[in-house]
């Protein structure tokens, strides 16, 4: 089971998955750019069934979603649902 660990570590993803998740089952996405002590970009996906997974930023399918979100946010105000912070 892939999990997000809330520890003292600056990187929050212990494991990452590249397995495709259909968009309709994604509730929200958090993107953490590299920095703040974590040397890599992290993408955390909350699914409609309340489970959480860290996704490999290189996965082609998540890149397609990110690109769509970028296009959307450039034409409309940012959608807060995709900006949820981990407590």
């Amino acid at each position: 089971v892939l999990e997000v660990y809330y520890t003292h570590l600056r990187c929050r993803c212990v494991q990452e998955s590249s397995v495709f998740i259909p968009r309709r089952f994604i509730d929200r996405i958090q993107i953490s750019p590299r920095g703040n002590g974590c040397p890599r970009k992290e993408i955390i996906v909350w699914k409609k069934n309340k489970s959480v997974v860290c996704v490999d930023p290189q996965a082609e399918w998540i890149q397609r979603i990110m690109e769509m979100l970028r296009k959307k946010s450039s034409s409309t105000p940012p959608v807060p649902v995709f900006k949820r912070k981990i407590p």
């Epitope: 089971v1 397995v19 495709f20 998740i21 259909p22 968009r23 309709r24 089952f25 699914k47 409609k48 069934n49 489970s51 399918w61 397609r64 769509m68 959307k72």
Partner: antibody, heavy 120, light 106 residues
């Protein structure tokens, strides 16, 4: 040729259980998300539940959460729907369908449907 | 949850006619909208996926358009085999079907 064959339907009393099965052939079953849909004349078509490639993730419509369980056996190329605490509003024809594969390709394969009647 | 409002519920037309069926979503569905045809006693069959992509093997007289919340299925030059029930389906967030349009011979 892709085939999806549902079985296990029938007449059942409210509050009782029923398990639907769907046997798949003609494609690599484990490469696909799978789903159950249903159709009852007054309500039209409804999505019921979906399951990921390995069965690790499942998703349900609100009205069946806690009562229905979707599962799969990739070794047998079979999809299941365990239906507990059945209600009259669950009466419908239930269809087994494919969803996306690993690449995001979304084919359109449906079984012939199986009738479930919940009545006393 | 996303609601899909499909109109009209019933449509009478003649062979050779051009008909349009509409679906309106309760929120933006980002073009994740499919159209299905269903004949009596059969499973639904997908005609169009993601707003305007024709499913393999489906005649080119079927076409789809739309964006945001508003989507349309157009059938040009109706053929006898086109008289059936049509449904839209959003798959942007879980799944929701429209209520269906029964296309009947006038």
């Amino acid at each position: 040729e892709v085939q999806l064959a549902e079985s296990g339907g029938g007449l059942v009393q409210p509050g009782r259980s029923l398990k639907l099965s769907c046997s798949a052939s003609g494609f690599t079953f484990s490469d696909y998300y799978m789903a159950w849909f249903r159709q009852a004349p007054p309500k039209g078509l409804e999505w019921v539940a979906s399951i990921s490639y390995d069965g690790g993730d499942s998703f349900y419509r609100d009205s069946v959460k806690g009562r229905f369980t979707i599962s799969r056996d990739n070794a047998k190329s079979s999809l299941y729907l365990q239906m507990d605490s059945l209600r009259s509003e669950d009466t419908a024809t239930y269809y087994c369908t494919t969803e996306e594969d690993y690449s995001g390709s979304f084919p359109d394969y449906w079984g012939q449907g199986v009738m479930v009647t919940v009545s006393s | 949850d996303i609601q899909m409002t499909q109109s009209p519920s019933f449509l009478s037309a003649s062979v050779g006619d051009r008909v349009t069926i509409n679906c309106k979503a309760s929120q933006n569905i980002n073009k994740y909208l499919n159209w299905y045809q269903q004949k009596l006693g059969e499973a639904p069959k997908r005609l169009i996926y993601d707003t305007n992509n024709l499913q393999a093997g489906i005649p080119s007289r079927f076409s789809g358009s739309g964006s945001g919340t508003d989507y349309t299925l157009t059938i040009n030059s109706l053929q006898p085999e086109d008289f059936a029930t049509y449904f839209c389906l959003q798959h942007n967030s879980l799944y929701t079907f429209g209520g269906g349009t029964k296309l009947e011979l006038k």
